[in-house]
């Protein structure tokens, strides 16, 4: 399906407001330095441009590739090599090469200050008086954060804090409609951030295989009534639309994500029949429905999996004849059957079968040699099922800042080479699994807490490639997409770790300690906590529980002093010096 | 576009020994699976062999193992069968195949076939 000019089909396809906004957003995954306004400018001009492609495809320069469009408009950035260094080398290079470039400085943890929220009047005010600029400047501060959000749902977060000013901003009570909302996108976004810069690691670390599995499973759960050919079918357009988001292609991604909407609502019959309220509503809200929908219910007839993939005589036969999509119907056919497991383990179990039929069916008796395979797949079964079943016990014991604490010191012990500020994040989101996850029924606890863990040590994984300091994390992040958290869950304490040195200062705090809100407390006293297990770390558990109340009551009452500042001065040395003492 | 040439076939004597090929063009010959099906006068499809992408794995029909031996050489992107000690129910057109698509694999119809090369066993 060509086209003369493709900044010209895909403005047609994807309207002016969706083509503008989307290509705010590639540019502000790129630059993420770029100031605002430069970024309207130059999105401005490229919209200006595919007007008159649109008027005429034959037009000059509208027959040039996206890559080549948006890659020479962004190389006009006057200030290319003094914001972003190395980056702007990328501009003496022809595309393909020229993007892959820009992909590469691709800044998952940019130097950017934390978004400060104004006062909720300071914000209606700016929003009634340009809605358009203040929406942009939504998706601008979004994207450049994120630089792997997935630009359609952007748009569609975008919609949705529109609505929430538009709605809020009338009443009576602005703060008490608005604030809610703006923390449940916020944390709704920083989720789906997570979630997709997954997908764009499988795809770019693993290869478009270690997807599409990831996607035969995650699909054939949701939609156990469909055929297998109808979900290799939907595998197919989503690993090409997530590939494209993935890889800058925003516009293909966008229009792409719309036919497959589409398609899915066209054919619900034989895909799921829990997708028709979905297909009521709006584009943006539609395909976000649909990414999110439940999964249907299991047809009540399956027959046994054994008879096709273990006690047939065409096992080998088969799995020669085509081996990927005889390992695709396997583990659709266990995945629909499934919706209790992970998809991580599904995937595990999918390889372990591979790894058995390579073995088999090159011997001298394959069936006698896979015979049993079924049952080794009892212990890769029952180790997610026991560490769920362990951590949600030691949530529902500690609740959630204990129980991140607890976590902080399990994995500091195990890398305490990563940086501290990593380390806090990353801990403190393992232990929002406890919430998440633990509260639901047995069927749905494995699923939630594997798959969520997997976002967050990716998250882990992507910012150590950036400054490697741990072999042991660059292979558990490097080695098996699938075996990623177990691999982290087996690591022990680092032996050959050399404790850091005591540093007071790291351990000196002051009066602007009471005025922060609690999430600051907490993420002040976890630095310190990882800082302790850092001096220590064969401390045992009483003896950083006891340092750690300790600090509880010390910044308690010297947030209670009048005057603060000289407690935190005479107090601070004292509780160095009793937690030095406690942990000798 | 996918295409698939069968050659080698012809007549011989009960006992005797032909060597088909099927020179493929146009897909992944060194990723994919192939096979070798046959059809006899007035009868239905028949499987005689697969190899796969690697030739780590080799199977056969009852009816032809320990005399036919099915191999291939992924840099010529040629598929071969060596069959030896023939005999008269042996007697069919030999079609090369690889999976294409659709639901089922061993569900012949979603193969991608070769036009056949008729082997002709008579005394």
């Known amino acids: 399906d060509t086209h003369k000019s493709e900044v010209a089909h895909r403005f047609k396809d994807l309207g002016e407001e969706h083509f503008k906004g989307l290509v705010l957003v590639a540019f502000s995954q790129y630059l993420q330095q770029c100031p605002f306004e430069e970024h309207v400018k130059l999105v401005n001009e490229v919209t200006e441009f595919a007007k008159t492609c649109v008027a005429d495809e034959s037009a000059e320069n509208c027959d040039k590739s996206l890559h080549t469009l948006f890659g020479d408009k962004l190389c006009t950035v006057a200030t290319l090599r003094e914001t972003y260094g190395e980056m702007a080398d990328c501009c003496a290079k022809q595309e393909p090469e020229r993007n892959e470039c820009f992909l590469q400085h691709k800044d998952d943890n940019p130097n950017l200050p934390p978004l400060v929220r104004p006062e909720v009047d300071v914000m209606c005010t700016a929003f009634h008086d340009n809605e358009a600029t203040f929406l942009k400047k939504y998706l601008y501060e979004v994207a450049r954060r994120h630089p792997y959000f997935y630009a359609p749902e952007l748009l569609f977060f975008a919609a949705r804090y529109k609505a929430a000013f538009a709605e809020c901003c009338q009443a009576a009570d602005k703060a008490a409609c608005l604030l809610p909302k703006l923390d449940e996108l916020r944390d709704e976004g920083k989720a789906s951030s997570a979630k997709q810069r997954l997908k764009c690691a499988s795809l770019q670390k693993f290869g478009d295989r270690a997807f599409k599995a990831w996607a035969v499973a995650r699909l054939s759960q949701k939609f156990p009534k469909a055929e297998f050919a109808e979900v290799s079918k939907l595998v197919t357009d989503l690993t090409k639309v997530h590939t494209e988001c993935c890889h800058g292609d925003l516009l293909e991604c966008a229009d792409d994500r719309a036919d497959l909407a589409k398609y899915m609502c066209e054919n619900q019959d034989s895909i799921s029949s829990k997708l028709k309220e979905c297909c009521d509503k709006p584009l943006l809200e539609k395909s976000h429905c649909l990414a999110e929908v439940e999964n249907d219910e299991m047809p009540a007839d399956l027959p046994s999996l054994a008879a096709d993939y273990v006690e047939s005589k065409d096992v080998c036969k088969n799995y020669a004849e085509a081996k990927d999509v005889f390992l695709g119907m396997f583990l659709y056919e266990y995945a629909r059957r499934h919706p209790d497991y992970s998809v991580m383990l599904l995937l595990r179990l999918a390889k372990a079968y591979e790894a058995t039929l390579e073995k088999c069916c090159a011997a001298a008796d394959p069936h006698e040699c896979y015979a049993k395979v079924f049952d080794e797949f009892q212990p890769l079964v029952e180790e997610p099922q026991n560490l769920v079943k362990q951590n949600c016990e030691l949530f529902e014991q500690l609740g959630e800042y204990k129980f991140q604490n607890a976590l902080l010191v399990r994995y500091t012990k195990k890398v305490p080479q990563v940086s501290t500020p990593t380390l806090v994040e990353v801990s403190r989101n393992l232990g929002k699994v406890g919430a998440k996850c633990c509260k639901l029924p047995e069927a749905k606890r494995m699923p939630c807490a594997e798959d969520y863990l997997s976002v967050v040590l990716n998250r882990l994984c992507v910012l150590h490639e950036k400054t490697p300091v741990s072999e042991k994390v660059t292979k558990c992040c490097t080695e098996s997409l699938v075996n990623r958290r177990p691999c982290f869950s087996a690591l022990e304490l680092d032996e050959a770790y050399v404790p850091k040195a005591f540093n007071a200062e790291t351990f000196t705090f002051h009066a602007d300690m009471c005025t922060l809100s609690e999430k600051e407390k907490q993420v002040k006293k976890q630095t310190a906590l990882v800082e302790l297990v850092k001096h220590k770390p064969k401390a045992t558990k009483e003896q950083l529980k006891g340092v750690m109340d300790n600090f509880a009551a010390f910044v308690e009452k010297c947030c209670k002093a009048d005057d603060k500042e000289a407690c935190f001065a005479e107090e601070g040395p004292k509780f160095v010096a009793a937690s030095q003492a406690a942990l000798a | 576009e996918v295409q698939l040439v069968e050659s080698g076939g012809g007549e011989v004597q009960p006992g005797g020994s032909l060597r088909l090929s099927c020179a493929a063009s146009?897909?992944?010959?060194?990723?994919?699976?192939m096979v070798w099906v046959r059809q006899a006068p007035g009868k239905g499809l028949e499987w005689v062999s697969t190899?796969?992408?690697?030739?780590?794995?080799?199977r056969y029909a009852e009816s032809v193992k320990g005399r036919f031996t099915i191999s291939r050489d992924n840099a010529k992107n040629t598929l071969y069968l060596q069959m030896n000690s023939l005999r008269a129910e042996d007697t069919a057109v030999y079609y090369c195949?690889?999976?294409?698509?659709?639901?089922?694999?061993?569900?012949?119809?979603?193969?991608?076939w070769g036009q056949g090369t008729l082997v002709t066993v008579k005394p």
């Open positions: 195949a690889t999976y294409r698509a659709g639901s089922r694999i061993g569900s012949y119809e979603d193969y991608y």
């Open positions: 190899i796969s992408d690697d030739a780590r794995i080799i």
């Open positions: 146009g897909f992944a010959f060194s990723t994919s699976g």
